[in-house]
Interface confidence: low
């Protein structure tokens, strides 16, 4: 009831609580001398459903039929109107549509750890939208029963608070849970179960992994567990990976011996357990423990390679580059690599550790036969050694590929293509790749990088270390046994319009004909492969068009003659250069006026 | 590491709402149960409203804040959100959020604490008549 209802009273029947789809009869009446003042004939009520007018009558009551009301609480509200006044609230009543529960399925009860409370979970079915009561009840051995209750409307989840005892583990409990509200009331099937069936282990705790002799390959993996355990699952992933090793285990106890661990590796390993073999339920997985394995001596052999330098008539550079071990090859932390450089003849051999360094640079006299030896080295060892033998790789001409075309791929990728050397081309025991960046000045500095291809290989795509706009200095080895033959070729993988022309720097008359001298264009300003250079003239003050020389573009080249000026004329001189995208723009301008005599 | 932290709290008039947020940092929860409970002053922390982490996301509330709150998350931005209409005193408290790594599909199991293995800080809420 709404209010304190002093004027009049609102009935509902058959009850305040009725099943969707029922009709109810509302009746409103005024209690005595509680109508419009001197007109009582001219009382007006007027019954609300919220805040809708649904039907209205003149007299001490009001009757009124409702159907159709949706599921909840609906409020009906009777109201008095007078002449010339505002209309006041009589009295009110609040109706409950529902449905009577349904079954309660799906019933199941779980113990969480052998010390743990029973707890029992179901599904309610179809919301009732009325007040409902449900009532959990457990039977066991010996006539015990308990039971609990909630008056949640929402209630799904009941502990019980009890804890089963494994004294008896094939006792039967039963549970059963009923629903109540003022439409009915319906309970679930029971559920039957022992202790075995329903006590779900606490997860395995203190989890530890002992390594010994710092050996991958003596590996145990400790933990606890209560008391009951008779199963675990052990599951065991590099840190890095999405996929589980999985390993079941019976009687345990605690411990169990991993033999498949990979060396110097981040795992992570976690541990569930089971009362009995087909009854019940694993616990959740434990936490994880996360353990580096112990490293082991390297495997697999290094990829060196090498340029020489000629210094003088008696001296060469050696410069040696290798890569990186792959993880699973250097099975630990390389500490250092350790270089071997021997003369063959004389037997003379140097060695030294290089740290911190994937290359070394030395001098050796340019007689004799050199070999180097190159191994990597971690706390347990050292890989077996790369051993290479000195050679001149561009020595014999028959070797050299043929055709060598490098061309775009993509973004950031160039493809390298070849034709077998005109020599016997099953010789070729494999192909090397090798490229850097192009500078000017032939630096020593600039990284090198390299791959090796089968001899059955004519292309390869270069990817590593290549950025746009850059020229490459490309060039393909054929070797066979001690011998080798090399072509190059220049390449990038995008490119455009130089930024800038050539800056000529001098002019310098010889005999009759003069020599034209430039900067190099910046590196990051050549826009990739430099193609041409264009050098123009024309004679100052005047209107013709330019004239121009094209000189093929070659790294070393900082000069050129032009011999078709006239004497005595002053003439404007600039330079532009020329990618497979286009010409850049003008360089400074220079004026020249040639002294010589005339023809 | 994991961390969940709330903001969005204040003192506000009867009547009035907040919004509460909270961000998920370490870990993404998007397709897990998360929760806001909220503990008064010498009251055990009392759970508000959840969602269930499973597909479409079903949201539990307390009988108490039916109807007035309105629990939701954006599972790309990793956040959670609690908006809160019509504010009463009753409502004062500091309010949690919890997440937990795995999905609760029942609404007995959403609303206990031991459910969530994350807790944040607390934002406070202060309502005044």
């Known amino acids: 009831k709404i209010d304190a209802c002093k004027r009049g009273d609102v009935t509902v029947k058959p009850s305040h609580v009725i099943l969707l789809g029922s009709t109810v009869n509302i009746t409103c009446s005024l209690k005595p001398r509680q109508g419009c003042f001197h007109y009582s004939r001219r009382n007006k009520l007027i019954l609300y459903k919220f805040d809708r007018r649904i039907n209205f009558h003149h007299g001490h009551s009001l009757n009124s039929q409702v159907t159709g009301l949706p599921l909840g609480t609906t409020l009906f509200v009777c109201k008095l109107a007078c002449i010339n006044s505002d209309e006041i609230q009589i009295c009110g009543a609040e109706i409950f549509v529902g449905v009577a529960p349904e079954q309660p399925q799906n019933l199941s009860c779980i113990q969480k750890g052998e010390q743990g409370t029973v707890a029992c979970t179901w599904e309610r079915g179809r919301d009732t939208h009325l007040y409902t009561e449900y009532t959990l009840q457990l039977s066991g051995p010996k006539n015990l029963t308990w039971q609990k209750q909630c008056k949640d409307i929402y209630c799904d989840y009941l502990d019980f608070g009890i804890n089963l005892t494994p004294e008896s583990p094939e006792s039967n409990f039963t549970a059963k849970v009923t629903a109540v509200n003022s439409l009915g009331s319906s309970s679930s099937l029971p559920s039957t179960f022992t202790f075995l069936d329903i006590v779900r282990p606490l997860p395995p705790w203190d989890i530890r992994i002992k390594f010994q002799k710092a050996s991958v390959s003596r590996c145990t993996l400790y933990w606890r567990d209560e008391g009951l355990v008779l199963l675990n699952r052990l599951r065991y992933r590099p840190s890095n990976s999405r996929l589980w090793n999985m390993v079941n285990v019976t009687k345990a106890k605690g411990r169990h011996d991993l033999l498949d661990l990979k060396p110097f590796t981040e795992y992570e390993f976690q541990i569930s357990s089971k009362l009995h073999l087909y009854k019940g339920s694993w616990s959740d997985w434990s936490e994880s423990l996360r353990a580096q394995t112990p490293e082991e001596e390297p495997t697999g052999m290094l990829d060196v390679w090498y340029m020489k330098r000629h210094i003088d008539y008696s001296r060469q550079q050696i410069s040696l580059f290798w890569k990186n071990l792959s993880v699973s090859e250097a099975r630990g932390k390389i500490l250092h690599y350790q270089v071997t450089l021997q003369e063959l003849t004389g037997g003379k051999a140097m060695t030294q550790n290089i740290t911190g360094h994937t290359s070394w640079t030395t001098v050796i006299p340019r007689t004799g036969n050199w070999a180097v030896a190159v191994s990597a080295a971690n706390s347990k060892g050292s890989s077996l050694p790369t051993r290479i033998n000195i050679m001149n790789l561009c020595e014999a001409g028959l070797l050299a590929p043929r055709q060598v075309s490098a061309n775009s791929e993509g973004m950031d990728n160039i493809l390298v293509t070849w034709q077998p050397p005109r020599k016997d081309p099953s010789a070729v025991q494999e192909y090397v790749v090798e490229w850097r960046e192009l500078h000017p000045g032939g630096d020593t500095q600039v990284p090198l990088n390299w791959l090796r291809s089968r001899p059955y290989n004519v292309s390869a795509l270069i990817s590593e270390n290549i950025k746009s706009y850059i020229c490459y200095e490309i060039r393909v080895y054929a070797l066979s046994g001690d011998q080798g033959g090399c072509s190059s070729i220049l390449g990038n993988s995008k490119h455009k319009a130089p930024l800038s022309g050539p800056h000529i720097n001098a002019i310098t008359e010889e005999k009759g004909s003069i020599l034209i001298s430039w900067n190099s264009i910046p590196v990051q300003e050549q826009m990739g492969c430099l193609l041409h250079y264009r050098i123009y003239w024309k004679e100052r003050d005047s209107n013709s068009q330019p004239q121009l020389c094209e000189i093929p573009y070659r790294v070393s080249q900082n000069s050129h003659p032009i011999n078709s000026l006239q004497p005595r004329v002053t003439y404007v001189l600039w330079m532009t250069a020329l990618t497979a995208a286009g010409e850049s723009s003008h360089g400074n301008e220079r004026e020249f006026c040639l002294q010589g005599k005339a023809n | 590491q994991v961390q969940l932290q709330e903001s969005g709290g204040g003192l506000v008039q009867a009547g009035g709402s907040l919004r509460l947020s909270c961000a998920a940092s370490g870990r993404t929860f998007s397709n897990y149960a998360m929760a806001w409970f909220r503990q008064a002053p010498g009251t055990e922390r009392e759970f508000v409203a959840g969602?269930?982490?499973?597909?479409?996301?079903?949201?539990f509330y307390d009988n108490s804040v039916m109807g007035r709150f309105t629990i939701s998350r954006d599972s790309a931005k990793n956040t959670m959100w609690l908006q809160i209409n019509n504010l009463k005193p009753e409502d004062t408290a500091v309010y949690y959020c919890?997440?937990?790594?795995?999905?609760?599909?029942?609404?007995?199991?959403?609303?206990?604490?031991?459910?969530?293995?994350?807790w944040g800080q607390g934002t406070q809420v202060t309502v005044s008549s």
């Open positions: 969602l269930s982490g499973s597909g479409g996301d079903t949201a």
């Open positions: 919890a997440a937990a790594t795995h999905v609760v599909v029942s609404y007995g199991l959403v609303r206990r604490r031991g459910t969530y293995d994350y």
